[in-house]
């Protein structure tokens, strides 16, 4: 019942897409949980911050995330409609000149401490595989997501399109 | 060119229904989300529902939930609104739209079709 | 659900007038509004999206502004082609509100 799987169709489209502007179009900020309503929080650790996946208690207050919307210009050549073809990246910062990166090498997701213009790793193209549901893919490496993987984020390879709706690559956003 | 074209309007009675399609082309009709806004005549815009055809996810305004269907087909490129239990309220020009951004719906309605009236009246 | 209002329900106008039209949302919607312009008979067409973002190909005479609640679209000099009924929208969540309208006519 799935299409061509853009996993692999645009693969080289990432890396040659470009952020058409260096304003993020929009911004929120949003506490992030996991598609099992696991809460995705930091905690300052040794002067760095560690990101964990774990159930809060009642009442607990959710942390929030800084998520700032860029419009990217998506190769023609890789694209059925042109120069309309158009995808969004995020970057997530949950606190000052902090924001999550990709690190590929490692397979992990880390908080960096970092100037603007802020390098690749820490863009992420924005997927609805659910209206309420978002995935972060890594424009540095397609076909990779942030994922959970034991009470972590982690960077999750996905092979096919149909594993785009895997609940452990799916988040949830609450701007409450 | 991106076109999207809307068909199986018509007059139809009070508890009827209707089955209008889109047909999608000039983009990967599995990248985007593709909604249905309809227009009462002399009226303003209201949103139905949207689909993402690669997942198959929905979702819908509450107030069409229960009578109206969406779903689609990917390997003909369409996008159909199944309408049950039809009122005269309903009566309106339905138009199919997409976003501009692939993967994501940000529900801003980039492209539209030319729309179907559908009247139900008795 | 949020509503969106729009003023004024109708305007006339001259062509080269600087026109403005204001959408007012009922809660806080940030700086997710669209507005399209819509003649008679035809589909709508995107002209701004997230408040003050021109979409491709929509001339530069056409701008927004506004967050939060009170948003404006400006048409700094109305043409010929300009004579439409215009609709705000709340984008990004659901369900997406319209406004009810504003329709320009000519003087």
């Known amino acids: 019942a799935f299409g061509i799987s853009g996993v692999q169709k645009y693969t080289r489209a990432l890396h040659d897409s470009s952020i058409t502007g260096i304003s993020p179009i929009t911004e929120y900020l949003a506490s992030l949980s996991t598609y099992n309503d696991q809460s995705i929080t930091f905690a300052l650790e040794d002067e760095s911050y560690e990101i964990y996946v774990e159930d809060l208690k009642k009442d607990e207050k959710k942390d929030k995330v800084l998520l700032s919307y860029y419009e990217s210009q998506h190769p023609s050549n890789e694209s059925g409609d042109g120069v309309d073809g158009k995808m969004l990246m995020v970057t997530l910062s949950p606190t000052k000149d902090f924001w999550l990166h990709a690190n590929n090498k490692e397979h992990s997701v880390e908080l960096h401490k970092c100037e603007k213009p802020l390098p690749d790793q820490a863009f992420f193209v924005l997927h609805n595989m659910h209206s309420n549901c978002v995935s972060f893919e890594c424009k540095t490496d397609p076909g990779v997501f942030i994922g959970v993987k034991d009470n972590h984020l982690a960077l999750i390879k996905v092979d096919s399109s149909e594993n785009l709706c895997t609940e452990n690559i799916l988040f949830k956003l609450s701007e409450t | 060119e991106v076109q999207l074209v809307e068909s199986g309007g018509g007059l139809v009675q009070p508890g009827g229904s209707l089955r209008l399609s889109c047909a999608a082309s000039?983009?990967?009709?599995?990248?985007?989300?593709v909604s249905w806004v309809r227009q009462a005549p002399g009226k303003g815009l209201e949103w139905v529902a949207e689909?993402?055809?690669?997942?198959?996810?929905?979702n819908f305004n509450e107030n069409f939930k229960g009578r109206f269907t969406i779903s689609r087909d990917n390997a003909k490129n369409s996008l159909y609104l199944q309408m049950n239990s039809l009122r005269a309220e309903d009566t309106a020009v339905y138009y199919c739209a997409r976003g501009p951004y692939y993967y994501s719906t940000q529900i801003i309605f980039a492209y539209w079709g030319q729309g179907t009236l559908v009247t139900v009246s008795s | 659900d949020i509503q969106m209002t729009q003023s004024p329900s109708s305007l006339s106008a001259s062509v080269g007038d600087r026109v403005t039209i204001t959408c007012k949302a009922s809660q806080n919607v940030g700086n997710n509004l669209a507005w399209y312009q819509q003649k008679p008979g035809k589909a709508p067409k995107l002209l701004i999206y997230y408040a003050s973002n021109r979409y491709t190909g929509v001339p530069s005479r056409f701008s927004g502004s506004g967050s939060g609640t009170d948003f404006t679209l400006t048409i700094s000099s109305l043409q010929p082609e300009d004579f439409a009924t215009y609709y705000c929208q709340r984008i990004y969540n659901s369900p997406p509100t319209f406004g009810g309208g504003t329709k320009v006519e000519i003087k």
């Open positions: 000039g983009f990967t009709f599995t990248d985007y989300w």
């Open positions: 689909i993402y055809p690669n997942s198959g996810a929905d």
